[in-house]
Interface confidence: low
């Protein structure tokens, strides 16, 4: 399977909400022994590999924001901790999973990574990630709503295969 990022860049005004999205592509085994661990974290564009550094999002670690379920099941974080920080991660039946960030500030600007680990019989089989940039703007040049820029299909940084 692969992880795709439909949008590589999100440009949003301060105070707006945004939902960053990744999508699980390809055949997904729905066996009872197969589960998926999905999470989000901030990173930097490393010299070796994008998403190599796992930083917290608004002081919440990748572990705080993770989802763990079978196949294309729906799930979302109901953690009070995440919601108190204006965050919620979710996953639907179609392989989409997302993180919603409320009331954006300039400090939220940066590189965001989604991570998916496929687990079989307690053994991790594949680990794939996607990356996208969030730019939060203020002042007269800021858009009135979030503007999203699609990823090019050639963008190897935004689709990783297992």
């Amino acid at each position: 399977f692969k992880v795709a990022t439909p949008y590589s860049l999100y440009v949003c005004p301060e105070g707006q909400n945004v939902t960053l999205t990744c999508r699980l592509l390809g055949p997904v085994d729905k066996g009872h022994d197969v589960t998926f661990y999905k999470t989000w974290y901030r990173s930097s564009r490393g010299e070796v590999q994008t998403c190599s550094e796992r930083r917290p999002i608004r002081n919440l670690t990748f572990q705080d924001l993770h989802l763990h379920h079978g196949g294309h099941q729906a799930a979302n974080t109901s953690h009070d901790l995440a919601q108190r920080h204006g965050l919620e991660s979710a996953s639907d039946h179609h392989g989409n999973f997302s993180i919603t960030m409320r009331n954006l500030t300039l400090l939220d600007s940066g590189l965001y990574c989604c991570l998916v680990v496929e687990i079989r019989h307690h053994h991790s089989e594949h680990r794939v990630h996607g990356a996208m940039e969030l730019q939060v703007q203020t002042g007269k040049d800021a858009p009135s709503n979030c503007v999203v820029y699609p990823s090019s299909s050639q963008d190897s940084e935004n689709i990783t295969a297992a």
Partner: antibody
Framework: EVQLVESGGGLVQPGGSLRLSCAAS????????MSWVRQAPGKGLEWVSG????????FYADSVKGRFTISRDNSKNTLYLQMNSLRAEDTAVYYC?????????????WGQGTLVTVSS | DIQMTQSPSSLSASVGDRVTITCRAS??????LAWYQQKPGKAPKLLIY???SLQSGVPSRFSGSGSGTDFTLTISSLQPEDFATYYC?????????FGQGTKVEIK
């Protein structure tokens, strides 16, 4: 069968350094985050440090931050803990542990432990 | 950091007894709680993760329950090999933190 075997413990003076190793076998090493957990004599368990199985991102307890460095050599299936500026309160049995479910913070396999004694 | 508090710190019981150990988190951790068993001179052994999921190979007399801040480990019928120290651990966030332990001794 999953096996974790620690080595490198011993007696060291305060301010000294020690490097612990943990040799892993029986599973795909790169698929799992790994941690070091310690236990002072007669005391409970304390997580020390963890490292990502894929990217080598590392995490530390406040008590060791800046003094200890976790690393791994995936080609050798080995986890390391470099311990510098050791203090008496670092005296403990050090266990390496594998994260259950790849990137979780529960630990499903543990080594037998290696004793580190910091004393003058 | 999230503090984990276990009670009791020790207990005496007989073979065949039903034993209950409780663990309380200083803040909500959803269902991200693990239980370990440790015998003297040995490494801890994972019994239960995600509050109630039994680790492979662990006898069914061990069970876990709870969510949020309050959790319980139950041994339905204590066996001779169950005399040990039990630790709870939150695996909700970094750093993972452990309870102080509950020693189960022979009465």
């Amino acid at each position: 069968e999953v096996q974790l075997v620690e080595s490198g413990g011993g007696l060291v003076q305060p301010g000294g350094s020690l490097r612990l190793s943990c040799a892993a076998s029986g599973y795909i090493f790169t698929g799992y985050d790994m941690s070091w957990v310690r236990q002072a004599p007669g005391k409970g368990l304390e997580w020390v440090s963890g490292i990502d199985g894929h990217f080598d991102s590392s995490f530390y307890a406040d008590s060791v931050k800046g003094r200890f460095t976790i690393s791994r050599d995936n080609s050798k299936n080995t986890l390391y803990l470099q311990m510098n500026s050791l203090r008496a309160e670092d005296t403990a049995v050090y266990y390496c542990a594998r994260s259950s479910y790849a990137v979780d913070l529960a630990f499903d396999y543990w080594g037998q432990g290696t004793l580190v004694t910091v004393s003058s | 950091d999230i503090q984990m508090t276990q009670s009791p710190s020790s207990l005496s019981a007989s073979v065949g007894d039903r034993v209950t150990i409780t663990c309380r988190a200083s803040q909500g951790i959803s269902s991200y709680l693990a239980w370990y068993q440790q015998k003297p001179g040995k490494a801890p052994k994972l019994l239960i993760y995600a509050a109630s999921s039994l680790q492979s190979g662990v006898p069914s007399r061990f069970s876990g329950s709870g969510s949020g801040t309050d959790f319980t480990l139950t041994i339905s019928s204590l066996q001779p090999e169950d005399f040990a120290t039990y630790y709870c651990q939150q695996h909700y966030t970094t750093p993972p933190t452990f309870g102080q332990g509950t020693k189960v001794e022979i009465k």
